[in-house]
C-alpha cells in the first residue's frame, strides 16, 4: 500500500524519492506522475528527468533537492484539495523490468483557522524502510553489468509515514539503500 504524506491547503507539499547515482552526473531517468505507477513509464506525467537534466515539468511541480545527487523528491507548490491522491515516482533503471516504482499518497487538509506553530518544513517526512527487489537471477545482473555508461549501485527512498514533522530534518538523509547487481 502507498505511504501517506500530508500537507495543508496553501502550503508546499513534499513527496520524497531518492536514488544514489554510481558517480556524480551518472544519472538515471526519473518520472513523476499523478496516479499509481503503471507497469511501464508514468501516467499523467508532471515532471521528468533524463540522464542530464529536468527535461519536462508542469507548473507548480519542481525538484527542490539536488537531483544530480539522486534527490528527486517532488515539491508541489501552493497545494489545493484537488492535489490529493496517489503520485508515482519511477526510477527508470535500464532494462525491461528493472524500474523501481514508488507510490506515495498525498492527503491535503483544509488550512487551519488558528495559526499553526512554526515549522521548519512544510512537509511530513518518513521513517526509512528497507526496500526489497525481486530477484530475477543472473540475467538481470548481466543486463545491468553490460551497460557501458550506467553502473548503478544503490537506490534509496524514504518510506513509512512519520506523523511528527519535528523529526523531518533528522530523517531527511536517512533513506534505506539497496544494491543492484
Amino acid at each position: 500500500s502507498e505511504v501517506e504524506y500530508r500537507a495543508e491547503v496553501g502550503q508546499n507539499a513534499y513527496l520524497p524519492c531518492f536514488y544514489t547515482p554510481a558517480a556524480p552526473g551518472n544519472l538515471v531517468p526519473v518520472c513523476w506522475g499523478k496516479g499509481a505507477c503503471p507497469v511501464f513509464e508514468c501516467g499523467n506525467v508532471v515532471l521528468r528527468t533524463d540522464e542530464r537534466d529536468v527535461n519536462y515539468w508542469t507548473s507548480r511541480y519542481w525538484l527542490n533537492g539536488d537531483f544530480r545527487k539522486g534527490d528527486v523528491s517532488l515539491t508541489i507548490e501552493n497545494v489545493t484539495l484537488a492535489d490529493s491522491g496517489i503520485y508515482c515516482c519511477r526510477i527508470q533503471i535500464p532494462g525491461i523490468m528493472n524500474d523501481e516504482k514508488f507510490n506515495l499518497k498525498l492527503v491535503i487538509k483544509p488550512a487551519k483557522v488558528t495559526p499553526a506553530p512554526t515549522r521548519q518544513r512544510d512537509f511530513t517526512a518518513a521513517f526509512p524502510r528497507m526496500l526489497t527487489t525481486r530477484g530475477h537471477g543472473p540475467a538481470e545482473t548481466q543486463t545491468l553489468g553490460s551497460l557501458p555508461d550506467i553502473n548503478l549501485t544503490q537506490i534509496s527512498t524514504l518510506a513509512n509515514e512519520l506523523r511528527d514533522s519535528r523529526l523531518a530534518n533528522d530523517l531527511r538523509d536517512s533513506g534505506a539503500t539497496i544494491r543492484i547487481g
Epitope: C37, P38, V39, F40, I96, A139
Partner: antibody, heavy 119, light 112 residues
C-alpha cells in the same frame, strides 16, 4: 516446470461480461509480468495488456482500455482478464503469456481460451 | 503504434530448402539501454505461439541451430537453413522496445 493453464473455451451472450483465468505454476508468480494477447480467427496476434503481480500495476494497449481489466490473485497464482460489453467482434482466442525479465519476450504461453460471443 | 510489417505473407518451400522471412518496423527498435527487443515466434495449427529467437539473434532453449536471426534498427530477418516438416506454421515477429508491444502480421511457411 512452468505452466500456464487456461480453460479451453467460453461461450457468452452479447452485452455481457466474462472473466478469463490463467493459473500459473512452476515458478514464483510475483516475479514475472503476465500479459494477455488475443488472436481473432485467421488473424495475427494483438497485445492487450500486462499486469505486474507483485503490485497489481497494469498497462493496456489503448485499443483495449475500457474493454479489458487485468487482475491477479497471488494466493492462487492466478491472473484474470475481465472483458466487458461483449460483442461478436470480441470472439477470439485469448492467451496469457509470461514475459522473461531479461528481454521482454514471452517465454511461456497458456494454451489459450477460445471466447465465442453469440446469441 | 509501432507497426511491424512481415514479408512474405506466404512462403512455399521444399523440405531441405533455406527459408528467409523479413520483418520491418516503422521506427527503430534500438532501446535507449542499447538492447534491441525484437523476437520471433512460431505458431503451429491449433497451438499457442512458441518462442524461437529473442533479442534479434538469441536462440531460445531447445530451438535447433538451423534457426538464426539477424538485423538491426528497423530491418530484421529470420533464416531457417534447412526446412524440416516440423518447421511448418506461421512465424510472427514481435517488438517489445516500445509500448504498446506489437506483432507482425505473420508469415505462413508451407510446403511447395
Amino acid at each position: 516446470q512452468v505452466q500456464l493453464q487456461q480453460p479451453g473455451a467460453e461461450l457468452v451472450r452479447p452485452g455481457t461480461s466474462v472473466k478469463l483465468s490463467c493459473k500459473a505454476s512452476g515458478y514464483t508468480f510475483t516475479s514475472y509480468w503476465m500479459h494477455w494477447v488475443n488472436q481473432r480467427p485467421g488473424q495475427g496476434l494483438e497485445w492487450i495488456g500486462v499486469i505486474d503481480p507483485s503490485d497489481s500495476s497494469t498497462d493496456y494497449n489503448q485499443k483495449f482500455k475500457g474493454k479489458a481489466t487485468l487482475t491477479v490473485d497471488t494466493s492462487s497464482s492466478t491472473a484474470y482478464m475481465q472483458l466487458s460489453s461483449l460483442t461478436s467482434e470480441d470472439s477470439a482466442v485469448y492467451y496469457c503469456a509470461r514475459n522473461d525479465y531479461d528481454g521482454g519476450y514471452f517465454d511461456y504461453w497458456g494454451q489459450g481460451t477460445t471466447l465465442t460471443v453469440s446469441s | 503504434d509501432f507497426v511491424m510489417t512481415q514479408t512474405p505473407l506466404s512462403l512455399p518451400v521444399s523440405l531441405g530448402d533455406q527459408a528467409s522471412i523479413s520483418c520491418r518496423s516503422s521506427q527503430s527498435l534500438l532501446h535507449s539501454n542499447g538492447n534491441t527487443y525484437l523476437h520471433w515466434y512460431l505458431q503451429k495449427p491449433g497451438q499457442s505461439p512458441k518462442l524461437l529467437i529473442y533479442k534479434v539473434s538469441n536462440r531460445f532453449s531447445g530451438v535447433p541451430d538451423r534457426f538464426s536471426g539477424g538485423g538491426s534498427g528497423t530491418d530484421f530477418t529470420l533464416k531457417i537453413s534447412r526446412v524440416e516438416a516440423e518447421d511448418l506454421g506461421v512465424y510472427f515477429c514481435s517488438q517489445t522496445t516500445h509500448v504498446p508491444w506489437t506483432f507482425g502480421g505473420g508469415t505462413k511457411l508451407e510446403i511447395k
